[in-house]
């Protein structure tokens, strides 16, 4: 791969335009933040492939890594990749923004990590501090990556001075996850049960031959002991399992169940806990919110999602205008309810290539023998605007009229504009807006009708032109939230016998 300019580091001016070229023996592509920005790809007569990335109106946010790579690395000897780092010094951008994954740094062992605070200017001096601390920490800084070193479990910020202004980065949180030398896991057949149902828990240890299990649980505290059963999972080496089974649970069995495992050889121990909830009866409750008015765009697919918690597993039904919905054989509607955790569910209604008739009142009902919940919303279908008619007429009054008719949902706005110089319009001259109250030479009359059956608005607008002394290009533009459409007509003076 050949990259021009070769880099590996470039410093470019803010607001400038810059061209990066990459060429190779197979198709090549530029990548930025794991995505492919718009670029021009070509193949030369000699068989080399190239891609040109034009960076326009550069800002500090364009600072970062750019990679050129083979578009399809199959069959190539090496998965070759060229890296280029671009700085765009920009005093309006302090530290480059980070996403949540970069702000919270989790570790499972003592290892070197990087606090990724980066600036747009390689000349800036950057220091690292504990959050709310003034003392700079002696950690090496790389302008392309950030501060690298071994960090304690704390929160840190970076500081720099841009001009006469001190700028702080977001805080970075370093958090070391505790990893024990005995690997214990506890799970339950169900963590939520109704009174009278069984509680069954399993505690599993991997990689130890001789261990001792000790359970603590709510019943134990009141002196009612339950004898656990210990077994070996024969198909796996050194997987030892302890099972605690409580038949016919009572409300008092709610609480924390802890499995403590000790191994006497190295004097290691570990414990894991799980929370069990015994409920008097089942429940269904909505989580999050769904607005009472939802929108879908005509001929596009739309998924409506409801999240709820329930135990025991509920039946879920969807209704439209009080009629039960089911998966349609034509594949126009798809219903699915997923169990995303033990008691949490996501129910989805997918409308494939939405039709006008699918507007209406939708309800999701989730229920079982103990409880039920329902959620309703109105679905509005948005239809992109279309100009259906644009016509010009010469009434006897001497004035000339142009009529524009169009439809869409939500209600379209109408914009009239005109251009007097046909040769230079509209590329060189901007069109003039018409129909403003201050304009004496044009008058506007607009009527709006809502068509119930088609569930869309029709707009009819008539533009009256008082005196047309030379050919005029009149444009009608309709616009709504999901699109716009334009038509144009040329209006000629009465005196001219033909239209251009």
């Amino acid at each position: 791969l050949v990259v021009t300019p070769p880099g590996p580091e470039l410093v470019l001016n803010v607001s400038s335009t810059f061209v990066l070229t990459c060429s190779g023996s197979a198709p090549v592509v530029w990548e930025r933040m794991s995505q492919e920005p718009p670029q021009e790809m070509a193949k030369a007569q000699d068989g080399t492939f190239s891609s040109v990335l034009t960076l326009t109106n550069l800002t500090g946010l364009d600072t970062g890594e750019y990679f050129c790579t083979h578009n399809d690395s199959r069959g190539l000897e090496t998965d070759e990749r060229k890296r280029l780092y671009i700085f765009v010094p920009d005093p309006t951008v302090g530290f480059l923004p980070n996403d949540a994954e970069e702000l919270f740094i989790f570790l499972t062992e003592i290892t070197e990590i990087t606090i990724p605070c980066r600036v747009t200017d390689p000349q800036l001096v950057v220091t690292l501090h504990e959050k709310k601390g003034d003392v700079a920490l002696p950690v090496p800084y790389d302008h392309q990556r950030g501060f690298s070193g071994i960090f304690e479990d704390r929160s840190y910020i970076c500081k720099t001075t841009i001009g006469d202004r001190e700028v702080d980065s977001d805080a970075y949180y370093v958090y070391r996850l505790q990893v024990s030398s005995i690997n214990v896991s506890v799970n339950a057949v169900q963590t939520v049960v109704r009174q009278g149902e069984n509680i069954t828990l399993m505690c599993i240890v991997i990689g130890n031959e001789v261990v001792n299990f000790e359970w603590t649980y709510p019943r134990k505290e009141s002196g009612r002991l339950v004898e656990p059963v210990t077994d070996f999972l024969l198909d796996m080496p050194y997987h030892i399992r302890s099972i605690l089974h409580i038949p016919s649970a009572e409300l008092e069995d709610s609480g924390t169940y802890t499995c403590n495992v000790t191994e006497s050889v190295n004097d290691h121990q570990d414990e894991k806990a799980i929370n069990i909830t015994v409920v008097e009866s089942g429940y269904v409750r909505l989580l999050g919110e769904v607005g009472t008015l939802q929108f879908a765009e005509l001929h596009r697919s739309r998924t409506l999602q409801v999240v709820f918690e329930a135990y025991p597993p509920p039946t879920v039904l969807w209704f439209k205008d009080n009629r039960t919905l089911g998966d349609s054989s034509a594949g126009e509607i798809a219903l699915s309810t997923r169990n995303v955790s033990e008691t949490r569910y996501v129910s989805e209604l997918t409308l494939v290539r939405v039709k006008v008739a699918e507007a209406g009142h939708y309800t999701m009902r989730a229920f079982h023998e103990d409880a039920e919940v329902q959620l309703s919303f109105q679905l509005q279908i948005n239809v992109p605007v279309r100009v259906l008619e644009l016509s010009e007429s010469h009434p006897d009054s001497g004035e000339q009229t142009v009529r524009c008719r169009g439809r869409g949902m939500p209600q379209p706005n109408i914009i009239w504009s005109a251009c007097r110089d046909l040769k230079r319009c509209p590329r060189e001259l901007p069109p003039t807006l018409l129909g403003n109250s201050s304009e004496e030479e044009s008058q506007l009359e607009t009527n709006v009708t809502y068509w119930e059956e088609e569930q869309e608005f029709e707009v009819v607008s008539t533009l009256r032109l008082q005196h047309v002394d030379r050919p005029l290009s009149v444009r009608c533009t309709l616009r709504n939230a999901v699109g716009q459409d334009t038509q144009e007509v040329i209006v000629v003076p009465h005196s001219l016998p033909f239209k251009v």
Partner: antibody, heavy 127, light 107 residues
């Protein structure tokens, strides 16, 4: 300087509507969960609701469900609370705060608290 | 829903005293607990998260402990700035719940 500034409070009649705003500065707003908390006169703190980084997850306390809506505009570094069908018991100082919710680690989730708060805006519901 | 109960509701103490505030959860919440301080007319301030982790910039006289259902906030040696109301707060993946508060005033 990391800062949150609430606005939009005032006097509103029962059944009426009000929209509170919270402007954020000094941090990457789009990378954080945000929360609304309220405090009735002479009473304790009550969580109203929260919203994740891109607005795809929203949660709220039962007493405001169906009446209040939380939203955000990351391009404007702003958090909003749309209050509809207000009641006398909604009278309070409303605070917005930054909620430190790291991405999940396997099955575990962690939480580092509400570390930045605004000064609050007062909402009075009275006829 | 999980209830958080703080005790005492009011506590009278003098500068230099060691102060302990308790927060009880109606069921096991592991270590999913934070503590806040609120001075009159001001916004709350985060002191402790994850039951025992001290927030940056908070004096080391504040400490938190506990897990499961019983938690404590300890102020090692009360300073004039510490006369305020303290709240515990439980969190899970889709809600937050505050205790009713403990007011620490001058004896």
């Amino acid at each position: 300087e990391v800062q949150l500034v609430e606005s939009g409070g005032g006097l509103v009649q029962p059944g009426g509507s009000l929209r509170l705003s919270c402007g954020a500065s000094g941090f990457t707003f789009s990378s954080y969960w945000m929360t609304w908390v309220r405090q009735a006169p002479g009473k304790g703190l009550e969580w109203v609701g929260n919203i994740n980084q891109d607005g795809s997850e929203k949660y709220s306390v039962d007493s405001v469900k169906g009446r209040f809506t939380i939203s955000r505009d990351n391009a404007k570094n702003s958090l909003y609370l749309q209050m509809n069908r207000v009641r006398a018991e909604d009278t309070a100082v409303y605070y917005c705060s930054r909620d430190l919710v790291p991405p999940r680690q396997g099955d575990n989730y962690y939480y580092f608290g509400m570390d930045v708060w605004g000064l609050g805006t007062t909402v009075t519901v009275s006829s | 829903d999980i209830q958080m109960t703080q005790s005492p509701s009011t506590l009278s103490a003098s500068v230099g005293d060691r102060v302990i505030i308790t927060c009880r959860a109606s069921q096991n919440i592991n270590n999913w607990l934070a503590w806040y301080q609120q001075q009159p007319g001001k916004a709350p301030k985060l002191l402790i998260y994850e039951a025992s982790s001290l927030e940056s910039g908070v004096p080391s006289r504040f400490s938190g402990s506990g897990s499961g259902t019983e938690f404590t906030l300890t102020i090692g040696s009360l300073q004039p700035d510490d006369f305020a109301t303290y709240y515990c707060q439980h969190y899970n993946s889709y809600s937050r719940t505050f205790g009713q508060g403990t007011k620490v005033d001058i004896k």
